[in-house]
């Protein structure tokens, strides 16, 4: 899975007037990393993990870059004609990736009111747009604006591609992000469901990377998908992830059930606690 840096910029307009604030979120390897708030842009590391990557007082550069990007996007929104009354948003998502073979990918995507209308491969400079007429009208409008100064655009987009990769490499050099593996903490809990049944929930937290297998087994055999309920794998704010799986079982049959976890080549089995309030915590 490649290392990635993802910028998500959003600007708003009200009744055709572009608002002064903007919001920028940066994700590093899929994790919330930096946030640039609406009114005063101050890059805020998302948790200790991000601070460790950035180091002390190195956010000035990020703040400057994100503020500049926000201004650019506000200007782009101002050039979108035929804006209807009310609130509208323009969103730019920029992603660059470094793959294991050191190859790179960079792309840029524009969304108006949450709908994708224009994408660009920042390496090949190739533009793509959806088929709908509304999206194509918006796309032509924005593309023309961005191409008004061809020289500026050329250097601008080359810089976007190069800068994104440069920043990503700089963050990776911190060593904090590099192909680390953090094993999950697994908790199994039980709660009363209907009469004669209990719900057993298996939670895995604090793991990295995000790929994980978590499932309930009966006598060592995985339960069918339709008898299990899974939570999404979500960032927990500490540079790691969390998820859960639950199922309903007959009271008295607890000993037949285990939660099976597999992560980064390691696995573990976790029984259902016998007491009602017991929580089993274990690392592999």
């Amino acid at each position: 899975e490649p290392h990635s840096l993802r910028y998500n910029l959003t600007v708003l307009s009200w009744d055709g007037s572009v608002q002064s604030g903007f919001l920028t979120e940066v994700h590093l390897d899929g994790q919330p990393f930096l946030r640039c708030d609406r009114q005063k842009c101050r890059a805020k590391p998302q948790g200790q993990w991000a601070e460790d990557v950035l180091g002390n007082k190195t956010w000035d550069r990020e703040t400057r870059d994100l503020t500049g990007n926000g201004k650019d996007l506000r200007m782009t929104l101002a050039h979108i004609k035929d804006q209807k009354e009310g609130l509208h948003s323009l969103q730019e998502i920029r992603v660059c990736e470094i793959h294991e073979d050191n190859s790179t990918r960079s792309s840029q995507h524009f969304y108006y009111d949450g709908e994708l209308f224009l994408s660009q491969n920042l390496e090949t400079k190739e533009w793509t747009m959806p088929q709908s007429s509304r999206a194509q009208t918006l796309a032509m409008n924005v593309r023309n604006f961005l191409k008004e100064d061809a020289m500026k655009t050329k250097t601008h987009y080359h810089a976007m591609h190069a800068d994104c990769l440069q920043e990503l490499r700089r963050y990776l050099k911190s060593g904090v992000v590099l192909r680390r593996t953090v094993p999950p903490m697994v908790n199994v809990t039980r709660s009363e469901a209907s009469e004669g049944n209990i719900t057993v929930t298996c939670r895995a937290s604090g793991f990295y990377p995000w790929n994980i297998t978590l499932s309930w087994r009966q006598d060592g055999v995985s339960l069918s998908h339709d008898t299990q309920q899974w939570g999404d794998v979500l960032p927990d704010g500490n540079g790691t992830y969390q998820t859960w799986v639950a199922t309903r079982i007959c009271q008295g049959e607890e000993q037949r059930f285990t939660c099976y976890m597999e992560h980064s080549g390691n696995h573990s089995t976790h029984p259902v606690p016998s007491g009602k309030v017991l929580v089993l915590q274990s690392h592999w």
Epitope: D219, S222, H267
Partner: antibody
Framework: EIQLVQSGAEVKKPGSSVKVSCKPS????????IYWVRQAPGQGLEWIGY????????IYNQQFKDRATLTVDKSTSTAYMELSSLRSEDTAVYYC???????????WGQGTLVTVSS | EIVLTQSPATLSLSPGERATLSCSAS???????LHWYQQKPGQSPRLLIY???NLASGVPARFSGSGSGTDYTLTISSLEPEDFAVYYC?????????FGQGTKVEIK
């Protein structure tokens, strides 16, 4: 390739004990349960019990609870089934098997013939 | 315990014929917990069909399974010479895990 290799045939006296070993390979030993099943000559299959090698949990068929002992040695990735107080009707082929993703017995050992005779 | 009764005990058929094997449970079981195994003389059993109707890896498409509740069926659409063997159904829904007594499919 997943394989379960069992120990060789045994001839035992009534009242004695037998210990059959099962060494799986081709997968992580502690990731799947090991089941034990026996088959008397010309008869059907009878489940003895299973062990979860990771946590050491054992579930027995009540019929064998007093005489069968299931163990694992994680250091050698080997499972064992010991049957005590042998009698002639325990003469059978004893199989170990691995629990699968979707069924109880997805891979089987080659079987160990235990003959109980005076 | 759930008792599985297989019928017939022996099925005498010729290659190319269709074989229908039945497995009846003494109480209802979920289709997720009914499996079929094939055993040839001197060999270990082999998983054939899991969860009522799913073919195990490497099992030819002429084998199929169906059923629900207490009645389950294994069908071999056209018997090949290598299909003559003993077939067992097995339930994993409740303890103890149990097998049927087997159906022997022999060459007529």
């Amino acid at each position: 390739e997943i394989q379960l290799v069992q120990s060789g045939a045994e001839v035992k006296k009534p009242g004695s004990s037998v210990k059959v070993s099962c060494k799986p390979s081709g997968y992580a030993f502690t990731s799947n349960n090991i089941y034990w099943v026996r088959q008397a000559p010309g008869q059907g299959l009878e489940w003895i019990g299973y062990i979860d090698p990771y946590i050491g949990r054992i579930i027995y068929n009540q019929q064998f609870k007093d005489r069968a002992t299931l163990t694992v040695d994680k250091s050698t990735s080997t499972a064992y089934m010991e049957l005590s107080s042998l009698r002639s009707e325990d003469t059978a082929v004893y199989y170990c098997s691995r629990s699968g993703e979707r069924s109880n017995f997805d891979y089987w050992g080659q079987g160990t013939l235990v003959t109980v005779s005076s | 315990e759930i008792v599985l009764t297989q019928s017939p005990a022996t099925l005498s058929l010729s290659p190319g014929e269709r074989a229908t094997l039945s497995c009846s449970a003494s109480s209802s079981i979920s289709s997720n917990y009914l499996h079929w195994y094939q055993q040839k003389p001197g060999q270990s059993p082999r998983l054939l069909i899991y969860r009522t109707s799913n073919l195990a890896s490497g099992v030819p498409a002429r084998f199929s399974g169906s059923g629900s509740g207490t009645d389950y069926t294994l069908t071999i659409s056209s018997l090949e010479p290598e299909d003559f063997a003993v077939y067992y159904c097995q339930q994993g829904g409740s303890l103890p895990l149990t097998f049927g007594q087997g159906t022997k499919v022999e060459i007529k």
